[in-house]
C-alpha cells in the first residue's frame, strides 16, 4: 500500500472550486460531497455561484469528478498502478484540453490535494472558439451522461501520467457531440509516486437535480473502477 493510499480507506469529504471563462462568459462553480475509494464511489453536488451556468452541466463532469480520479477503485492486483492515490496528500496538477467536435475547446488546470482531511479540487477553465448557437453555448445537450473508458499510461519523463479518452454527449436531436480529451497529471510533491502500466478506468455517472435547490446546480453520482491489467501468473497458481 502506498502512503497516499492509506488516506482513502474510509469516506473522504470533497470540495471543488472552479473559475471559468468560456468565450468571455465568466462563471464560478462550487461543489461538495464525498468519495469512497473502497467502492470507487463519488457523490457530489455542484452549484453555479454566479447565476446561470453558460455551458451545459454535462460538459463539466470530466473537469469536476474525473478530476478526482484518486477515488477510483483499484482492485488488489492493480494497486501498484494507482498513480492518483500515491501522489497524496501533496496531490497532483491535472491539465486537460478538451476538443468538442465542430465547436470550441476547453483548457483546464487543476490542483487536487488534501487540505486537512478534505480532498480539494481547485480548477481554472478557459474555453475558446465556441459557436454561440452550437451545442455547447446553445445548450443543446441532454442532461445525462454515458459510460466511458479512460485510458491511462505512464509519462516517465514528467514523473506522471498521460490520459486520453473520448466522451459522447447526447444531443437533444438524438445525435452525439464528441469531446476529445487529452490529460496530463504531474505530482505536486517530490515524494515517490507509482507510475502505472497501461490500463483504463471504467466510469458510470448519473446526473440528477435536487428538488429543493433553487440555484442552477447538478447532482452527480459516479462509480469508477480500474481495469485492463490481468492477474499476474503467480495469482493464477494460488
Amino acid at each position: 500500500m502506498s502512503k497516499g493510499e492509506e488516506l482513502f480507506t474510509g469516506v473522504v469529504p470533497i470540495l471543488v472550486e472552479l473559475d471559468g471563462d468560456v468565450n468571455g462568459h465568466k462563471f464560478s462553480v462550487s461543489g461538495e460531497g464525498e468519495g469512497d475509494a473502497t467502492y470507487g464511489k463519488l457523490t457530489l453536488k455542484f452549484i453555479c455561484t454566479t447565476g446561470k451556468l453558460p455551458v451545459p452541466w454535462p460538459t463539466l463532469v470530466t473537469t469536476f469528478s474525473y478530476g478526482v480520479q484518486c477515488f477510483s477503485r483499484y482492485p488488489d492486483h492493480m494497486k501498484q498502478h494507482d498513480f492518483f492515490k500515491s501522489a497524496m496528500p501533496e496531490g497532483y496538477v491535472q491539465e486537460r484540453t478538451i476538443f468538442f467536435k465542430d465547436d470550441g475547446n476547453y483548457k483546464t488546470r487543476a490542483e487536487v490535494k488534501f487540505e486537512g482531511d478534505t480532498l480539494v479540487n481547485r480548477i481554472e477553465l478557459k474555453g475558446i472558439d465556441f459557436k454561440e448557437d452550437g451545442n455547447i453555448l446553445g445548450h443543446k445537450l441532454e442532461y445525462n451522461y454515458n459510460s466511458h473508458n479512460v485510458y491511462i499510461m505512464a509519462d516517465k519523463q514528467k514523473n506522471g501520467i498521460k490520459v486520453n479518452f473520448k466522451i459522447r454527449h447526447n444531443i437533444e436531436d438524438g445525435s452525439v457531440q464528441l469531446a476529445d480529451h487529452y490529460q496530463q497529471n504531474t505530482p505536486i510533491g517530490d515524494g515517490p509516486v507509482l507510475l502505472p502500466d497501461n490500463h483504463y478506468l471504467s466510469t458510470q455517472s448519473a446526473l440528477s437535480k435536487d428538488p429543493n435547490e433553487k440555484r442552477d446546480h447538478m447532482v452527480l453520482l459516479e462509480f469508477v473502477t480500474a481495469a485492463g491489467i490481468t492477474h499476474g501468473m503467480d495469482e493464477l497458481y494460488k
Partner: nanobody
Framework: DVQLVESGGGLVQPGGSLRLSCAAS????????IGWYRQAPGKQRESVAL???????TYGDSAQGRFTISRDDAKNTVYLHMDDLVPEDTAVYYC??????????WGQGTQVTVS
C-alpha cells in the same frame, strides 16, 4: 518548444483554390492538435479548422464545406485545402499548435488575398 512555419499563401481570383502548409518542428510529441486561424483587417482572429492527434477534425463556420484540413505525419505537416475562395476569405492565416497545458504555439502567418 515547437516551431511552426506556414507557406502557400498568395493572391488568387474569386472561385480559385489554394493549399496552405504548416510544417512543425521541435518538441512535436507535446502537441495534441494543430489548426488554422485567420484574421482579416479590423476583425477578430477566428478558428478555421483543427485536427487533433486522434484524428478528430473540426471546422469553423466559415470553412464548412469549402475547406479541408489534412496532415502528413511523416512530414510533420498540416495542410489546409481551400476551394471556392471568395473576397471575404482574404486574411492572414495562422498555424496554431495546442499542447495539453495552457499556452499555444503560433506561426508567423501567411497572407491570402482573394481579388
Amino acid at each position: 518548444d515547437v516551431q511552426l512555419v506556414e507557406s502557400g499563401g498568395g493572391l488568387v481570383q474569386p472561385g480559385g483554390s489554394l493549399r496552405l502548409s504548416c510544417a512543425a518542428s521541435g518538441e512535436i510529441a507535446s502537441i495534441i492538435a494543430i489548426g488554422w486561424y485567420r484574421q482579416a483587417p479590423g476583425k477578430q482572429r477566428e478558428s478555421v479548422a483543427l485536427i487533433t492527434r486522434s484524428g478528430m477534425i473540426t471546422y469553423g463556420d466559415s470553412a464548412q464545406g469549402r475547406f479541408t484540413i489534412s496532415r502528413d505525419d511523416a512530414k510533420n505537416t498540416v495542410y489546409l485545402h481551400m476551394d471556392d475562395l471568395v473576397p471575404e476569405d482574404t486574411a492572414v492565416y495562422y498555424c496554431n499548435a495546442k499542447k495539453v497545458s495552457f499556452g499555444d504555439y503560433w506561426g508567423q502567418g501567411t497572407q491570402v488575398t482573394v481579388s
